[in-house]
């Protein structure tokens, strides 16, 4: 299995955006890579977003995705937007080397993202 590293903890900003780097130790010379972000909460794992990209090119997530990202070498900088307190959880980075063979897959230990909803501004007279 391929080794995937990601930070243990990240705090989302006041606008509900969190960014973290997902780095993989590529044993092959992949030209096409797939990155998937999974969220684990209460032993349930759900897919947050996924993108396939060609080495040296931008990551392209679906138009309605809450994720954006950039790649550089064996690093992917992932940004998740629109997070709320209820979205606090463990976000796992899964990397697959899709082409050419051999196929490799690696899963990180996860990044615990903490999201704190901003306090509403008090009404001013």
């Amino acid at each position: 299995a391929m080794h995937v590293a990601q930070p243990a903890v990240v705090l989302a900003n006041s606008r509900g955006t969190a960014s973290f780097v997902c780095e993989y130790a590529s044993p092959g010379k992949a030209t096409e890579v797939r990155v998937t972000v999974l969220r684990q909460a209460d032993s349930q794992v759900t897919e947050v977003c996924a993108a396939t990209y060609m080495m040296g090119n931008e990551l392209t997530f679906l138009d309605d995705s809450i994720c954006t990202g950039t790649s550089s070498g064996n690093q992917v900088n992932l940004t998740i937007q629109g997070l709320r307190a209820m979205d606090t959880g463990l976000y796992i980075c899964k990397v697959e080397l899709m082409y050419p063979p051999p196929y490799y897959m690696g899963i990180g230990n996860g990044t615990q993202i903490y999201v704190i909803d901003p306090e509403p501004c008090p009404d001013s007279d």
């Epitope: 030209t31 096409e32 996924a50 060609m54 090119n57 697959e96 899709m98 082409y99 050419p100 897959m105």
Partner: antibody, heavy 120, light 112 residues
């Protein structure tokens, strides 16, 4: 159900052209590399061409380089093989094949094949 | 001439153990690429039998096993049955050809 369905085979004269199609269903087509593999009558399997999930990377066997073109339309979940300057030795059953398990790169899904006959 | 070399035929009686070899080179099996084995019954499309040298897809009986060493690999079938009569192909990615290469195939005959 995961499925591949080839079409477009038939009888063609030497020097002629054919376009094969492979319709995929039951898996995330755009994520996975696809290949064409052929089998001449009474002979073994021969890999013809492969294309990455995005279509950005393509490889051909030397025997078809410059004559065959592989392509894919991810919006239609379809793989194509444009075959030009066909020769008698291209006569074969053509299979499209892929791996969609996310466990390995072996071809665990095959179509039923489409027969291409090159003869005058 | 296939890039991977297999014996053209093999045979055995029911219950016996049969081994099929697959020899490659430093640009495919010897380069560390995994070997996959396919079974093709008469008149049907190939079916994945063994992947990543020695792993079985679900539904494949444990009578089938694979191994790899250096530039060669082998498929072993124990407790041979009449329904095992088929063509068997090994395959691996080839670094220098930038493509998949297959063995020429081995026709397995179950005698008696």
């Amino acid at each position: 159900e995961v499925q591949l369905l080839e079409s477009g085979g038939g009888l063609v004269q030497p020097g002629g052209s054919l376009r094969l199609s492979c319709a995929a269903s039951g898996f995330t087509f755009s994520s996975y590399a696809m290949s064409w593999v052929r089998q001449a009558p009474g002979k073994g399997l021969e890999w013809v061409s492969g294309i990455s999930g995005s279509g950005g990377y393509i490889h051909y066997a030397d025997s078809v380089k410059g004559r065959f073109t592989i392509s894919r339309d991810n919006s239609k979940n379809t793989l194509y093989l444009q075959m030009n300057s066909l020769r008698a030795e291209d006569t074969a059953v053509y299979y499209c094949a892929t791996y969609s398990s996310g466990l390995h790169d072996a071809f665990d899904i095959w179509g039923q094949g489409t027969l291409v006959t090159v003869s005058s | 001439q296939s890039v991977l070399t297999q014996p053209p035929s093999a045979s055995g009686t029911p219950g016996q153990r049969v081994t099929i070899s697959c020899t490659g080179s430093s640009s495919n099996i010897g380069a560390g690429y995994d070997v996959h084995w396919y079974q093709q019954l008469p008149g049907t499309a190939p079916k994945l039998l063994i992947y990543d040298n020695n792993k079985r897809p679900s539904g494949v009986p444990d009578r089938f096993s694979g191994s790899k060493s250096g530039t060669s690999a082998s498929l072993a079938i124990s407790g041979l049955r009449s329904e095992d009569e088929a063509d068997y192909y090994c395959a691996a990615w080839d670094d220098s050809l930038n493509g998949w290469v297959f063995g020429g195939g081995t026709k397995l005959t179950v005698l008696g």
